[in-house]
Amino acid sequence: LSSEAPITGEGQATGIREMDGELTAAPTPEQSDRGVHFVTTAPTLKLLNHHPLLEEFLQEGLEGREEAPRPALPFQPDSPTPFTPSPLPRLTNQDNRPVFTSPTPAVAAAPTQPHSRKKPWNPESEPPELYITSPLPPGPSMAVPTLHPEDRPSTTPPSQAWTPTQEGPGDMGRPWVPEIMSKTTGLGIEGTIATSTASGDDEETTTTTIITTVTTIQPPGPCSWNFSGPEGSLDSPAVPSVPSDVGLDCLYYISVYPGYGVEIKVKNISLQEGETITVEGLGGPDPLPLANQSFLLRGQVIRSPTHQAAVRFQSLPLPAGPGTFHFHYQAYLLSCHFPRRPAYGDVTVTSLHPGGSARFHCATGYQLKGARFLTCLNATQPFWDSQEPVCIAACGGVIRNATTGRIVSPGFPGNYSNNLTCHWLLEAPESQRLHLHFEKVSLAEDDDRLIIRNGNNVEAPPVYDSYEVEYLPIEGLLSSGRHFFVEFSTDSSGAAAGMALRYEAFQQGHCYEPFVKYGNFSSSAPSYPVGTTVEFSCDPGYTLEQGSIIIECVDLRDPQWNETEPACRAVCSGEITDSAGVVLSPNWPEPYGRGQDCIWGVHVEEDKRIMLDIRVLRIGSGDVLTFYDGDDLTARVLGQYSGPRGHFKLFTSMADVTIQFQSDPGTSALGYQQGFVIHFFEVPRNDTCPELPEIPNGWKNPSQPELVHGTVVTYQCYPGYQVVGSSILMCQWDLSWSEDLPSCQRVTSCHDPGDVEHSRRLISSLKFPVGATVQYICDQGFVLTGSAILTCHDRQAGSPKWSDRAPKCLLEQFKPCHGLSAPENGARSPEKRLHPAGATIHFSCAPGYVLKGQASIKCVPGHPSHWSDPPPICRAASLDGFYNGRSLDVAKAPATSSALDAAHHHHHHHHHH
């Protein structure tokens, strides 16, 4: 309610502050680490539902710009008009920088040199050069000539003939030309084919015409084509006239306008054994694997959540020639993820596409913290302009003009915290009184306390004190005046759910608004004057108990309801004949009791069946929930369950199901919370599996429209989400799905960045959540290159990512030692000016001279490197010394292991972390 003003924060509320409006916090947009500024020369695509923000750029795109364009393939062979780049819209990014910058010639990091022949194309490192071109001025529909195998002339062209779409690491001469089709849109825009630039040994050739001749057959190498229109067709390479002994490696590179994704539909596919097709989404921080040949069945639709995609076809040399396929792609408008629903609140979305908005509101008793409205902004990956808000229960507050509403303790329905003192002042409108319903009061059995005072301050007389009263008054409380003063205090130990109170103001001569927990009511008059009748009903799964279904406001002098309001309770057992409904464990959402034996019968029309959607199942290991496929306990058991279990579904083969629940008489069920929630639906009896729902933050791709036996449905998640459960569900022979429905869960952590050789790492948390850090420190003798500290960052449009890649610890490089001169009357080996760290030099003396000192000395690695010993000298030997063989031609050093061979050298002052 807008009149509710909370006291912010928890802890001691020293007084009551009155506030206007709601407590809100300035939104903090999530910062994106997408540093890439997308560059394109493409026109705005005029597609359905396109954001109006882009419209103003369309006309501009059709006016020429004085820039020398790179030649592109014309739509008509005799067309004299070259394509010109079109200007770009400036769209807001998370950090308020433009997402799309001014045009520059290339779209996708085009290398300056043409690709080499040998290097395989790697979409992660360098996509092929791609030029997206503007359309011609509007005119009649035009189509790209399609090259068919039968159209090929028999003449042999010069040795450097090129297919117009040849790009990347392709072989110099291609033995056949692929079929390339591009469908015309309403604007006359074609999926244009990029210019080819190929480099021979000495020259560079640029071609802008379709070559319909073929070269003398050469072994086919890798092949690639670019597609840049809003839609087009991808076809397998045509069969060569002579079988090749070299396989194929073909790449189809698709790029549509940023802000759009690429949707690829499999029209036809027939591959030979050993052939592979992979589909990847490009244009994001990392290539995104989307599908491979095992999933690419006819009718399958693959969606890349980025504006670029690549299809790679690899074939071994096959006697029968390569397999065939025919795919169709089209651009589709990307959308923001579905905003997170706040706990104790809700969200309504006008559209997930750019320009759409999400409106948040909180359940009664909770205040919204954050932005009430979010807008989806256009970008390469659209994003919300602010973080989703949260709904919080405030500790105290003043509620002026209180009509109907609710106050809840902080943390409700979870536990409250310790050492709280919360005061609420409820003030009804002038000349009205208040009624309080006790929705829930659950206090820890210690010094936690709830006092309700009949007045507007702490001195007013109490009408309810949890210290004094064991049971809650069913009829609630009435104020004698305009005010109630509510005090809620907790001590330093223990906690429980706290309290939820519902208040209603009523005028003189009227009754207060009734309330039924887990139910609803209809009234014959809106303000409940004397004579009003109210009829109660319960929420699905609940039954009316204690009290009457219909009550009346009576007594003109002191209006009051003639009977107490009824209660809605989840009861043990029942017979249900509705086409849809709910079965709840006894006393839900409170814990069920021990020693219960409950039976529910659910019956639908004879020619129908029942789907049981078990949404919550949290029972003890000694408790049993059994489903019987029929109308009594002798029927076939559909399933029997004990202990907690995740969401699952069951399908009956009959029009009746019997549900039995037996709780263990010996143990307390309290440890298992609630119990179970079973939704049931009447479903048609037919030869298809039941329709599968869409999942939040993801989409589904059925292999065919009818969900007949054998149909495969693949679920995929939007960027930043991952599939939890099985992503592939198959319609089984019994017309049930092979797996439970998966969900798309927000990826909240980074992958383990791994250990780095010759280092140790310090981690701030084990599972690498957003904000976690990993610090690498090299072992001694090694130098760190890269970032020593990595931080896991959240990203609006994708999974969390490390701030950098893991570093490397490289062996320290040492400077060489300067050469020593040979001793007088001696020699050194080797004779060099510089000696690398770890090297050894050997000294020898001329005949008649004796070596004094070390015969071999070593260049010891260090900063600086230094010789292990001083150089020796050669002294003249005495005659008897000479004849005794004490002077050697070459003095041999004792064998020592080279420090360089085995040691990892390092000095600690030269580390860079």
């Epitope: 280092s759 610090q775 001694q780």
Partner: antibody, heavy 120, light 106 residues
Framework: EVQLQQSGPEVMKPGASVKMSCKAS????????MHWVKQNQGKSLEWIGE????????GYNQKFKGKATLTVHKSSSTAYMELRSLTSEDSAVYYC?????????????WGQGTLVTVSA | QIVLTQSPAIMSASPGEKVTMTCSAS?????MHWYQQKSGTSPKRWIY???KLPSGVPARFSGSGSGTSYSLTISSMEAEDAATYYC?????????FGAGTKLELK
């Protein structure tokens, strides 16, 4: 002057946990990692692990993973080590230590040690 | 992990005598560090990066070696040098220490 002041001796029962402290002074606590070293009665030294007080990152000797937990309290410039599930094998002197510079690999500054005795 | 073996485990020397103790590594290491520890006190950094002496360590101490073989030498033993000496490497994580050489005064 760099000083590392460790908490006093502890006598513990098997199965219990012990938490010792190491208060640093004479330098900026968050600028250097804090290391912990065990010296048992046989006098050999073993590196347990280290913590970066700035980011809270920890690294452990595989042998002490699950046995030791390192934490810091930045505002008081104090490092802590908790040892759990104590056995007689854990009876030893435990030192906190700091390297000379951020990029050095030898322990230049040592605490006076905390003697832990585990006995039934 | 790299194992450091110190020898001898115990040795004694007279004042003025030259003393050499060794530390052998199970794999090649780039540097060796040495610590002196006297009974009831914490270890002290005595030699670092194979051959460097921190301030306060007498010049009669020296260190040398490379690869898997390192040594600490006292050119002329003095009474105050009686202690246990430990070698330590960190060329591979985890850092490891030798079992120590106890030097006694004869």
């Amino acid at each position: 002057e760099v000083q590392l002041q460790q908490s006093g001796p502890e006598v513990m029962k098997p199965g219990a946990s012990v938490k010792m402290s190491c208060k640093a002074s004479g330098y900026t606590f968050t600028d250097y990692n804090m290391h912990w070293v065990k010296q048992n009665q046989g006098k050999s030294l073993e590196w347990i692990g280290e913590i970066n007080p700035n980011i809270g990152g920890t690294g452990y000797n595989q042998k002490f993973k699950g046995k030791a937990t390192l934490t810091v309290h930045k505002s008081s410039s104090t490092a802590y080590m908790e040892l759990r599930s104590l056995t007689s094998e854990d009876s030893a002197v435990y030192y906190c230590a700091r390297t000379y510079s951020y990029y050095s690999y030898e322990f230049a500054y040592w605490g006076q040690g905390t003697l832990v005795t585990v006995s039934a | 992990q790299i194992v450091l073996t110190q020898s001898p485990a115990i040795m004694s020397a007279s004042p003025g005598e030259k003393v050499t103790m060794t530390c052998s590594a199970s794999s090649s290491v780039s540097y060796m560090h040495w610590y002196q520890q006297k009974s009831g006190t914490s270890p002290k950094r005595w030699i670092y990066d194979t051959s460097k002496l921190p301030s306060g360590v007498p010049a009669r101490f020296s260190g040398s070696g490379s690869g898997t073989s390192y040594s600490l030498t006292i050119s002329s033993m003095e009474a105050e040098d009686a202690a246990t000496y430990y070698c330590q490497q960190w060329s591979s994580t985890p850092p490891t220490f030798g079992a120590g050489t106890k030097l006694e005064l004869k």
